[in-house]
Interface confidence: low
C-alpha cells in the first residue's frame, strides 16, 4: 500500500493548562523508519516527539506504537502553555543503514492555537488630582493573552468613551500578547461618584469580559464654595457668624477664623455633611461678643482644602461707636474671595 501521512486537522485551539491531541495516521509502515513530530519547518524546526520510548515531559503517544500493526501516531500534549503555539508536522523517515535517516513524507501540518486568558485589566490615572473641566488621561493594561485578537472598551458612567490610543504588542507573531489603551476624560464637579471602566473581551472569556475600574473620587478635587453670613442675634450682646464651605472633595479641610487679621479660632471639621453627589459640606459657627468691640472688626473665614491655597471670605462688624441704637451692631459682608498664597 502506498505511504500517506495524514494530519486530518488543519488547526486546533486549546486553553492554556488543558490538553490537546494532534492526530496523525499512516497508510503503511513501509519503508521501515521512525515517525517524528516537529514544530515549524526548515533547519530551525524543533523536534517535539519521536516514538522511541524516551520520556518527553507532557507528551504521550495516544495509541500503543509498539504494536506491529499500529498506524496511529497521534500525540497528546498536556498542560499546554503559550510557548506550545505553532504548526506541528508528523514526519515519516526511512531508516538509513550507514547514512542518517531520510525524510520521505510529511503530513500537512496542524496549527496549535493556545488560548491564554488576559490578565485582569489594571487602570491607572494621574498621580495628582485634577479639577473640574480639566482633561486627564487613564491607561488600561492587560497581558498574557493569546490569540492576539482582543477587544478593549472604555466606559464612564455607562457611556462608552473613545480611546486616544490602543496598542497590542508585540506586533509580530508571539506566544502571548499585551494590550495598552489610553483614554482622555474631562472631569466635572459631579464626578466624585463616577467610575471609569476598562472592559476587555477575548475568546477565552466566554462572553464574560474582564473589567478594570478607576474610581474618579481618587483623581478629582472639587474646591469648596465659601460663604460667610450673619445670623439673627441670640441676645443683645452677641452676633452669630456662620462660615459655610459647600460641595468640596476630598474631605481634607481646615478652617480658621481671624479677627482683624489675627487668628481667633482654629476649626478642625469633624462632622461633615455628605451630599448625594459625593461632595461634602461644612458649617462653622462663630459667636462674637459685641460688647467687647467698640470699633469696626473685620472677621475673616479662611478655608484650606486638600493642601491648596487658602480661600478667604471677610465680614465686617461695625462697633458700638457707629451705632445709634446701643443694643445692636451693624454688619457688612464682603464675600469677594481673596487668595492667600502663603
Amino acid at each position: 500500500k502506498e505511504l500517506k501521512v495524514t494530519q486530518p486537522e488543519k488547526s486546533v485551539s486549546v486553553a492554556a493548562g488543558d490538553s490537546t491531541v494532534l492526530n496523525c495516521t499512516l497508510t503503511s509502515l513501509l519503508p521501515v523508519g521512525p515517525i517524528r513530530w516537529y514544530r515549524g519547518v526548515g533547519p530551525s524546526r524543533l523536534l517535539i516527539y519521536s516514538f522511541a520510548g524516551e520520556y518527553v515531559p507532557r507528551i504521550r503517544n495516544v495509541s500503543d506504537t509498539t504494536k506491529r500493526n499500529n498506524m496511529d501516531f497521534s500525540i497528546r500534549i498536556s498542560n499546554v502553555t503559550p510557548a506550545d503555539a505553532g504548526i506541528y508536522y508528523c514526519v515519516k523517515f526511512q531508516k538509513g543503514s550507514s547514512e542518517p535517516d531520510t525524510e520521505i513524507q510529511s503530513g500537512g501540518g496542524t496549527e496549535v492555537y493556545v488560548l491564554a486568558k488576559p490578565s485582569p485589566p489594571e487602570v491607572s490615572g494621574p498621580a495628582d488630582r485634577g479639577i473640574p473641566d480639566q482633561k486627564v488621561n487613564f491607561t488600561c493594561k492587560s497581558h498574557g493573552f493569546s490569540p492576539r485578537n482582543i477587544t478593549l472598551k472604555w466606559f464612564k458612567d455607562g457611556q462608552e468613551l473613545h480611546p486616544l490610543e490602543t496598542t497590542v504588542n508585540p506586533s509580530g507573531k508571539n506566544v502571548s500578547y499585551n494590550i495598552s489603551s489610553t483614554v482622555r476624560v474631562v472631569l466635572n464637579s459631579m464626578d466624585v461618584n463616577s467610575k471609569v471602566i476598562c472592559e476587555v473581551a477575548h475568546i477565552t472569556l466566554d462572553r464574560s469580559p474582564l473589567r478594570g475600574i478607576a474610581n474618579l473620587s481618587n483623581f478629582i478635587r472639587v474646591s469648596p464654595t465659601v460663604k460667610v453670613t450673619q445670623q439673627s442675634p441670640t441676645s443683645m450682646n452677641q452676633v452669630n457668624l456662620t462660615c459655610r464651605a459647600e460641595r468640596f472633595y476630598p474631605e481634607d479641610l481646615q478652617l480658621i477664623w481671624l479677627e482683624n487679621g489675627n487668628v481667633s479660632r482654629n476649626d478642625t471639621p469633624k462632622n461633615l455633611t455628605k451630599n448625594t453627589d459625593g461632595t461634602y459640606n461644612y458649617t462653622s459657627l462663630f459667636l462674637v461678643n459685641s460688647s467687647a468691640h467698640r470699633e469696626d472688626v473685620v472677621f475673616t473665614c479662611q478655608v484650606k482644602h486638600d493642601q491648596q491655597p487658602a480661600i478667604t471670605r471677610n465680614h465686617t462688624v461695625l462697633g458700638f461707636a457707629h451705632s445709634s441704637d446701643q443694643g445692636s451692631m451693624q454688619t457688612f459682608p464682603d464675600n469677594n474671595a481673596t487668595h492667600n498664597w502663603n
Epitope: T81, A83, F145, N174, V175
Partner: antibody, heavy 119, light 107 residues
Framework: QVQLQESGPGLVKPSQTLSLTCTVS??????????WSWIRQHPGKGLEWIGA???????YYNPSLKSRVTISVDTSKNQFSLKLSSVTAADTAVYYC???????????WGQGTTVTVSS | DIQMTQSPSSLSASVGDRVTITCQAS??????LNWYQQKPGKAPKLLIY???NLETGVPSRFSGSGSGTDFTFTISSLQPEDIATYYC?????????FGGGTKVEIK
Amino acid sequence: QVQLQESGPGLVKPSQTLSLTCTVSGGSISSGGYYWSWIRQHPGKGLEWIGAIYYSGPIYYNPSLKSRVTISVDTSKNQFSLKLSSVTAADTAVYYCSKEGYHSGMDVWGQGTTVTVSS
Amino acid sequence: DIQMTQSPSSLSASVGDRVTITCQASQDISDYLNWYQQKPGKAPKLLIYDADNLETGVPSRFSGSGSGTDFTFTISSLQPEDIATYYCQQFAYLPWTFGGGTKVEIK
C-alpha cells in the same frame, strides 16, 4: 545549571505586604518552557503551593491565597517575585521559589527564606 | 482541590530494609505525580517525576509506581543518608497539592 536565590525581609508586621524576589542564575527566565513557582512551608508542617508564572504572562494562583497574592516576572533582571498582602501570623513560613519544567516536577529549588509575621 | 493522602505519616526502619510509602489522590490524576525528599533545614529535592521516572542523579534504590489514584514510593535498601521527610505532589489539576509527608527514621 540553573540556580535560584530568594531574597526579602525576614520580618513583616501584621496587615503589611510580604515581598520576596527570586533571582535566577545559570539560565534565562525568558527562554520558555518553564514555570517559576512559589511554595511555602509553615513551621513543622507540609508544603503548600502558592502559585506559578510563565515568563510571558500566564499566572496561576492557589485559590486559597488568590485574593492576597501577586506573582510577577522581570525578565530584564532575570527575577520573579511574590507579594502577599494583609499578612497575619498564619503567614509565618519558609518561602521557596522553584523552577518547574513543563509541569513535570520542580527540579530546581532555592534554599528557602524564613519570613516571620510579628509586630 | 485534589486531596493527597500520604501514609504512613512516619516510620522507623533498619538500614538495608525495604521501605514503602503510599499516596492516594482524591480523584484520577493519571500519572501526574512527583515524589520529593526533604532533609531538615533544606529545600525539597525532586526524586521521581511522572509517577515512575527517576530524576537524573538520583540513586536507583528509589523508585515509584502507580497510576490513577494509588501510588507507591519505594526505597529498596534504606541507607543512613535517606533519613528525611518524603512528599508526593500532584500536578494534574490546579492548584498543585502535596501529600502531608512521611518522616523516615532509622531504628
